[in-house]
Every structure is written in structure tokens, then in C-alpha cells.
């Protein structure tokens, strides 16, 4: 089989600080040395890119400085963290993995992680 399987958790609950973390694991059909990982958000039928990073196997993921994502890699497993989430960001987050080099190229699409974000209740004014 030449398809690449990507596994990710079905559901994740963001912390009260709007941070959500999940693992994206891929079964590599080849010996990739350069990999691109992209987090996509699917809302209705619209798919948008949340963040992306290309890394060399054995090295750390490097997202752009202004990215809301951070991550670490270990073998065929990527630990992804998305920050700054609010209730309106609740949705399906898909992990996409591309084995860029060496040939052949492989594409892997996860089934998505439903991230639930609950905005914290404002603290009530306290009278002393």
C-alpha cells in the first residue's frame, strides 16, 4: 500500500488559557529525511491553513515567529501545540504530513482532532 496513514486524537479540550496540544503520528512508507507538517482547520467545507513547518528528521520543528503553533518531533511523531485559542476557534483541526524528500513524495491526511475551546468566565468583582 502506498498510502501514508496519519493518526491523531479524535477530541482535545483546550486549557483555560486557550492552549491545546495533540500528537500527530504518521506511518512513513519510505525513509523520509525532510517532512512538512501542516495544521488545517475545517469549518463546514472550508479548509484553512493554521500553521506549517518543514523539518529535517532528527531536528526540531520550526514554525514562523508569528505562528500560533509550536511543536516537537520524535521519529514519526509530532507533538503540536496551538496557542491563543478562543471559543470561536472550536472546530476540527487536521494534521497534514508531506514527505518532501527523498523521492517519492507522500501525502498523509489525518481524520482531524475536534478541539473544544471554552472562554474563561470573567472574574466577578469582589467587594471587601
Amino acid at each position: 500500500c502506498k498510502a501514508m496513514h496519519v493518526a491523531q486524537p479524535a477530541v482535545v479540550l483546550a486549557s483555560s488559557r486557550g492552549i491545546a496540544s495533540f500528537v500527530c503520528e504518521y506511518a512513513s512508507p519510505g525513509k523520509a529525511t525532510e517532512v512538512r507538517v501542516t495544521v488545517l482547520r475545517q469549518a463546514d467545507s472550508q479548509v484553512t491553513e493554521v500553521c506549517a513547518a518543514t523539518y529535517m528528521m532528527g531536528n526540531e520543528l520550526t514554525f514562523l515567529d508569528d505562528s500560533i503553533c509550536t511543536g516537537t518531533s520524535s521519529g514519526n511523531q509530532v507533538n503540536l501545540t496551538i496557542q491563543g485559542l478562543r471559543a470561536m476557534d472550536t472546530g476540527l483541526y487536521i494534521c497534514k504530513v508531506e514527505l518532501m524528500y527523498p523521492p517519492p513524495y507522500y501525502l498523509g491526511i489525518g481524520n482531524g482532532t475536534q478541539i473544544y475551546v471554552i472562554d474563561p468566565e470573567p472574574c466577578p468583582d469582589s467587594d471587601f
Epitope: 501542516t38 491553513e49 501525502l107
Partner: antibody, heavy 118, light 108 residues
């Protein structure tokens, strides 16, 4: 408007060269991988070449390897295909196509005709 | 290279009838990586179905896709006059990206 527009096709003699261009508009060009696909007269679709987001990774069909070179200029929202050592069998309509975030080719140009004949 | 074989080569159907197109892969293709395109004479291909069964934006629900592994199907439930065209399947899970040879759906 989200679109791709090819140009640069024409009539060329066997052994000659041609450079195709594809102008992208209406979307963030650098966020997508791109392809060239061709279609010989009365025939089916044949994938020709792929280029990654930043242009660092390129793949080619065996039929064009060593003769064609794909490139992109993200600052100009443009994709290119340099075709050298052209053969009669390269005669086709050439399409540029965008890879959607989920993998299929969701946006195509109108195509540009390349005819290789003496 | 994954070879995709489409059948039949030509399908003659009357408007309003159902059309069933087949695409068989030489080796297993993950269902997430199989697409169908429609092409009319003089026009560029148009994405219909991706991920074997998800309809692309703006595609009417009379088009549906199914299948997994090596066998995939595109079904047009009730053919409209504008549906008479050539249909291609494609795998996009690994390089080289490959297309089937196409099925022409013509008016009976």
C-alpha cells in the same frame, strides 16, 4: 477573483525550447504546492511536474525528466515551466493546477497550447 | 507508479438515468487520496470529488463517490444535459501523481 492564467505556448520545432508561465491571483500563492498537467490532442490527462511551497522540492514525470524544469516566484505569484529539447510527443495543452490543502487539484488554468512540429 | 484503469471507456446514457463509472488502482490507494474530475470539450478539468467521497465546493449532490482500497466508483444519480463529458479519476497520495485514462459519458 481566484484564478490561474497560463501563457507562453506556441509552435516550436523539434529540439527547440519554450517557457510557459502561470499567473496566480486571488489567493496566497506561497501557501500552495503547484503542478503542471498536460493533455495531448484527443488524449487524457498526464501529470508533468510538481513544485513545493518554497520551490525547494521538485518532481517530474519520467517522460520529461532532464528536459523540463519547473520553478516559481512567490513574490510575483508566478509558476513557470522551462521546456527544452522538445519532441513531437510533447505537443499538448499545458495546464497549471493548484493543489488544495487536502491534496486534489482544485484550481486549474485555462491551458496553453504547445505544438512541436517541423 | 500507481496505474488507474477506468471502465467503461464510453458510457451511453439517456438524460435522467443513472451513470456508474469505475476506477481500479494497480495497488491500494488510501480513500483520502482519490479524486474525480469532469472535463468538457475545450475546457480545463473541474474537481468533482476528493477523498473518494467528499464533494468539492459547488458540486451538486447528484454526484457521489464511493470505494476504498483499489476499487472506486463515481455515480451520477440523474444525468442532466450538462453532465455529458469526460470523467477522470486521480490518485494524489504519492508521486508520480496519476490519472485514469478517462470515461466518456455520452447521450444515448
Amino acid at each position: 477573483e481566484v484564478q490561474l492564467v497560463e501563457s507562453g505556448g506556441g509552435l516550436v520545432k523539434p529540439g527547440g525550447s519554450l517557457r510557459l508561465s502561470c499567473a496566480a491571483s486571488g489567493f496566497t500563492f506561497s501557501s500552495y504546492t503547484m503542478h503542471w498537467v498536460r493533455q495531448a490532442p484527443g488524449k487524457g490527462l498526464e501529470w508533468v511536474s510538481f513544485i513545493s511551497y518554497d520551490g525547494n522540492y521538485k518532481y517530474y514525470a519520467d517522460s520529461v525528466k532532464g528536459r523540463f524544469t519547473i520553478s516559481r516566484d512567490n513574490a510575483k505569484n508566478s509558476l513557470y515551466l522551462q521546456m527544452n529539447s522538445l519532441r513531437a510527443e510533447d505537443t499538448a495543452v499545458y495546464y497549471c493546477a493548484r493543489t488544495s490543502h487536502l491534496g486534489p487539484f482544485d484550481l486549474w488554468g485555462q491551458g496553453t497550447m504547445v505544438t512541436v512540429s517541423s | 507508479e500507481i496505474v488507474l484503469t477506468q471502465s467503461p471507456g464510453t458510457l451511453s446514457v439517456s438524460p435522467g438515468e443513472r451513470a456508474t463509472l469505475s476506477c481500479r488502482a494497480s495497488q491500494s490507494v488510501g480513500s483520502s487520496y482519490l479524486a474525480w474530475y469532469q472535463q468538457k470539450p475545450g475546457q480545463a478539468p473541474r474537481l468533482l470529488i476528493y477523498g473518494a467521497f467528499s464533494r468539492a465546493t459547488g458540486i451538486p449532490d447528484r454526484f457521489s463517490g464511493s470505494g476504498s482500497g483499489t476499487d472506486f466508483t463515481l455515480t451520477i444519480s440523474r444525468l442532466e444535459p450538462e453532465d455529458f463529458a469526460v470523467y477522470y479519476c486521480q490518485q494524489y497520495g504519492s508521486s508520480p501523481w496519476t490519472f485514469g485514462q478517462g470515461t466518456k459519458v455520452e447521450i444515448k
